[in-house]
């Protein structure tokens, strides 16, 4: 059912990394436009991306209001140039997205090793605490501030001269590891939320090796 010559959106998909959240859908419009609505389970629907010919809508501003809520979005289809027209049910054609809970589902972005510092046979590796678009009291929160101890980092490290990897874990953004004196090491980190059932791990950070500019060496 629905308005003549309009088709319902389909393949509604959430694309979300570190809470930056975009809804995508198909098809590319032909003689129609779209409006998106988003709501928590309260049913207080908010309209976004009015009468757009895009097939994506940035919903970050809405979901960051409460990342632990579960959201649903719906995409309405209207004939181009006649957006007041409705279908036989007295409503425009629409389709619902899957449910989306940002805290449980947003992808963890690729982390970055901020620095590493060697003091004797110990190396302190620091992971950059990326700022998110989640706000509290007008300030943007970091990933650590949002997830707290739910977020851990895994460090992979190995001697530059060999391929055998070791691992370490932390629920802060810092590692303190033992190394062999006189050896150069390479490092990569991964963000992990162990309690999740989906999207548990980020991709690995770029590899950083001792003897390059991010490091500092002290006897």
């Amino acid at each position: 059912s629905g308005t003549t010559n309009t088709v319902a959106a389909y393949n509604l998909t959430w694309k979300s990394t570190n809470f930056k959240t975009i809804l995508e859908w198909e098809p590319k419009p032909v003689n129609q436009v779209y409006t998106v609505q988003i709501s928590t389970k309260s049913g207080d629907w908010k309209s976004k991306c009015f009468y757009t010919t895009d097939t994506e809508c940035d919903l970050t501003d809405e979901i960051v209001k409460d990342v632990k809520q579960t959201y649903l979005a719906r995409v309405f289809s209207y004939p181009a140039g006649n957006v007041e027209s409705t279908g036989s049910a007295g409503e425009p054609l629409y389709e619902n997205s899957p449910e989306f809970t940002p805290y449980l589902e947003t992808n963890l972005g690729q982390p970055t090793i901020q620095s590493f510092e060697q003091v004797g046979t110990k190396v302190n590796v620091t992971v950059e605490d990326e700022r998110t678009l989640v706000r509290k009291n007008g300030t943007f929160l970091t990933l650590r501030q949002v997830f707290g101890k739910d977020l851990i980092y895994t460090l992979y490290y190995w001697k530059s001269s060999s391929s055998g990897k070791k691992t370490a874990k932390t629920n802060t953004n810092e590692f303190l590891i033992d190394v062999d004196k006189g050896e150069n090491y390479c490092f990569s980190v991964q963000a992990v939320i162990p309690s999740r059932t989906v999207n548990r791990k980020s991709t690995d950070s770029p590899v950083e090796c001792m003897g390059q500019e991010k490091g500092e060496f002290r006897e």
Partner: antibody, heavy 118, light 107 residues
Amino acid sequence: EVQLLESGGGLVQPGGSLRLSCAASGFTFSNYAMSWVRQAPGKGLEWVSSISGSGDYTYYTDSVKGRFTISRDNSKNTLYLQMNSLRAEDTAVYYCARSPWGYYLDSWGQGTLVTVSS
Amino acid sequence: DIQMTQSPPSLSASAGDRVTITCRASQGISSRLAWYQQKPEKAPKSLIYAASSLQSGVPSRFSGSGSGTDFTLTISSLQPEDFATYYCQQYNSYPYTFGQGTKLEIK
């Protein structure tokens, strides 16, 4: 555990009024849309009205528009249905239900019987 | 208004049977359909939403399928506690409407 407890039903004469209440517990009340559904004796289910979590959006079935008013007090975790100009055909068990996104009905109260008769 | 038609109106079956109840909408409702179970003198209970999503706590022998206008509720192996009346409901557009119910009785 989600609990919904209706009250306020009873016997009323045609043209009279009743106010039903539904006390909610076990969940964050303001985070959910809520609905009223009724069931006449020996009959099927009929959706009556829904309200969004904020109370800003309300919806009614045609047969009760202008006579019934749905409302909520989020500070008291309570849903209401004010029923005026009652008719014999409004006789039913009235259920309150939690309604995620204002869509389906995932938790129901035990119901309260409203009888409209002279 | 969207009319919802359930069939059959009543059904006799035995424990262990596989049972299918159908629901047809008078116009397309995508997957915006729910199923409920009601036992005598009790409140309805949610079984399925979004045509095929199982409500939390509902046994996996219940399943739903369909999209557009035709939907089914299937009970893979009837248990004694499943004898009840089943209703479908569309939430595509207001006023939301229910099917007339299917009474599942013991054979």
